[in-house]
């Protein structure tokens, strides 16, 4: 049985030109986290694997950073960037848990700062 | 340039452990992921597991009872115990090399391939 | 496991002509699929990993296209050392899969 939860950062805003760090937590199990896989749309923008590290796909190499911890760094912001995100946690022996964060990358200076997690 | 060259008995009974090592030149297996990828004849590929850069083992579910990976950091090598063969695990048995950073799970590094029979 | 489905199976293309080779994902993999070339006798070669990049030293006459559960390769003008057997595989979770391989040959 599925048990666990995620928590992630939610709806959150950024400037354009700017940063911001998308974070996902999976709490209420002990299952073992092998994978963590970082997506938008139909792209895949990153893999954390428990064994090999991290790898950044290659469309988004110049302007994703990983972390931190099982987090991921959004650089450079355009407002083509505004959409939805998700981390997939492959997880043993629970399966698949998927968390759901908004983001807003705004044109102005009006970016609302309350955001935990996010990058001044 | 990564060169891997797998060594091992060609004939193995059933119901006995297939053994097989790989020697790695050209690159420190303390780098990277190293795995074992089967082949059995006219068929397609299945990729049995790897030992990681840090030691760390995963294993395909299919066969994760009867396999072992490891390694000898000494002599730049790692090894495949498959315990309890039967004919289904005749094939040409591949050593690969896979760099997760840049390619993700695509495997950019091969041996030649030394093939396996099992027969009484 | 996320099994990986190629078509077709076997394939014949003149000299020069275009040769596509397909392939789908069990589920939604994202981009997360490379693709081999093995001629017979030798092991297989990466060509194209997440979904559209070309390997080192891969002659841009190969292409990858697609994401989410459908791939493509294709070799836009068939040479005769391309004759080969074409394998497709998903990294986008382990166990990591392959697809059942397309042979490629001259008509």
């Known amino acids: 049985m599925m048990t666990g939860t995620i928590e992630t950062t939610g709806n959150i805003s950024a400037e354009k030109g700017g940063s911001i760090i998308l974070q996902c937590h999976l709490s209420s199990t002990t299952a073992q986290v092998t994978q963590v896989n970082w997506e938008q749309q139909d792209q895949l923008l990153a893999i954390c694997n428990a064994d090999l590290g991290w790898h950044i796909s290659p469309s988004f190499k110049d302007r994703v950073a990983p972390g931190p911890g099982l987090g991921l760094t959004l650089q450079s912001l355009t407002v083509n960037d505004t959409g939805e995100y998700f981390c997939i946690y492959h997880t043993y022996p629970d399966g698949t848990y998927t968390g759901r964060i908004f983001l807003e990358v705004l044109e102005s200076s009006v970016a609302e700062h309350g955001a935990r997690f996010q990058i001044p | 340039e990564v060169q891997l060259q797998e060594s091992g008995p060609g004939l193995v009974k059933p119901s006995e452990t297939l053994s097989l090592t790989c020697a790695v030149s050209?690159?420190?297996?303390?780098?990277?992921?190293w795995n074992w990828i089967r082949q059995p004849p006219g068929k397609g590929l299945e990729w049995i597991g790897y030992?990681?850069?840090?030691?760390?083992?995963y294993y395909n579910p299919s066969l994760k009872s009867r396999v072992t990976i490891s390694r000898d950091t000494s002599k730049n090598q790692f090894s495949l115990k498959l315990s309890s063969v039967t004919a289904a695990d005749t094939a040409v048995y591949y050593c690969?090399?896979?760099?997760?950073?840049?390619?993700?799970?695509?495997?950019?590094?091969w041996g030649q391939g030394t093939t396996v029979t099992v027969s009484s | 496991d996320i099994v990986m489905t190629q078509s077709p199976d076997s394939l014949a293309v003149s000299l020069g002509e275009r040769a596509t080779i397909n392939c789908k994902a069990s589920?939604?993999?994202?981009?997360?699929v490379a693709w081999y070339q093995q001629k017979p006798g030798q092991s297989p070669k990466l060509m194209i990993y997440?979904?559209?990049y070309r390997y080192t030293g891969v002659p841009d006459r190969f292409s990858g296209s697609g994401s989410g559960t459908d791939f493509t390769l294709t070799i836009s003008s068939l040479q005769a050392e391309d004759v080969a057997v074409y394998y497709c595989?998903?990294?986008?979770?382990?166990?990591?899969?392959f697809g059942g391989g397309t042979k490629v040959e001259i008509k």
């Open positions: 589920q939604n993999v994202r981009t997360a």
């Open positions: 595989q998903q990294y986008y979770t382990t166990p990591w899969t």
């Open positions: 997440s979904a559209s």
């Open positions: 030992i990681s850069y840090s030691g760390n083992t």
């Open positions: 050209g690159y420190s297996i303390t780098s990277d992921s």
């Open positions: 690969a090399r896979l760099d997760f950073s840049n390619y993700g799970g695509a495997v950019d590094y």
